[in-house]
């Protein structure tokens, strides 16, 4: 039975050209985390395996850095990075937990004026 919950950084915004940390945290379970997958929409960004460590997808290796922790750092952001990101925790014996983060990348001038957007 799945008793845990995923907490995420939720809905966030960042400036074009900047960087952002995507963070998920699994709580309220004693299940062992065997692997965390980070996916952008339907593409695999990175994997953190408990035994093998990090693997960054080749198409993202120039702009994605592992960590901090099980999180992921996205660099050199572009407007095309706007969208949803998923952290998928593979655990034993619970199974998989999924968290969703929505990132909006703003033009610098817009971000400076404190633009806000509504969920998603």
């Amino acid at each position: 039975m799945m008793t845990g919950t995923i907490e995420t950084t939720g809905n966030i915004s960042a400036e074009k050209g900047g960087s952002i940390i995507l963070q998920c945290h699994l709580s309220s379970t004693t299940a062992q985390v065997t692997q965390v997958n980070w996916e952008q929409q339907d593409q695999l960004l990175a994997i953190c395996n408990a035994d093998l460590g990090w693997h960054i997808s080749p198409s993202f290796k120039d702009r994605v850095a592992p960590g901090p922790g099980l999180g992921l750092t996205l660099q050199s952001l572009t407007v095309n990075d706007t969208g949803e990101y998923f952290c998928i925790y593979h655990t034993y014996p619970d199974g998989t937990y999924t968290g969703r983060i929505f990132l909006e990348v703003l033009e610098s001038s817009v971000a400076e004026h404190g633009a806000r957007f509504q969920i998603p």
Epitope: T82, F102, P120
Partner: nanobody, 114 residues
Framework: EVQLVESGGGLVQAGGSLRLSCAAS???????MGWFRQAPGKEREWVSS???????YYADSVKGRFTISADNAKNTVYLQMNSLKPEDTAVYYC?????????WGQGTQVTVSS
């Protein structure tokens, strides 16, 4: 701008099923489409997303009970909801899940009685 109209909600007993539909006025191909819901007095929350290659994602609270699907030819996204619980009671909305959205449709009300 693609207009979205949700339908299929209703009153159902706990353990029952409903199938929600979201009809789009334009193509949904190559767009990530999602279902969201808002219960009374709570914030709107993400439920599920689907992509043009069939890849799907689900919130943990609905995983194993809800199934998202899309018919690109009909420009329609569906949410099959089984084993409904009272806590699933909410207004359900569909949206382009990869786009900041300022205007939501009217949604469709789902009420699950115990």
């Amino acid at each position: 701008e693609v207009q979205l109209v949700e339908s299929g909600g209703g009153l159902v007993q706990a353990g029952g099923s409903l199938r929600l539909s979201c009809a789009a006025s334009g193509s949904i191909f190559n767009i990530g489409m999602g279902w969201f819901r808002q219960a009374p007095g709570k914030e709107r929350e993400w439920v599920s997303s689907i992509y043009s290659n069939g890849h799907t994602y689900y919130a943990d609270s609905v995983k194993g009970r809800f199934t998202i699907s899309a018919d690109n030819a009909k420009n329609t996204v569906y949410l099959q909801m089984n084993s409904l619980k009272p806590e699933d009671t909410a207004v359900y909305y569909c949206a382009n899940s990869n786009k900041p959205k300022f205007d939501w449709g009217q949604g469709t009300q789902v009420t699950v009685s115990s």
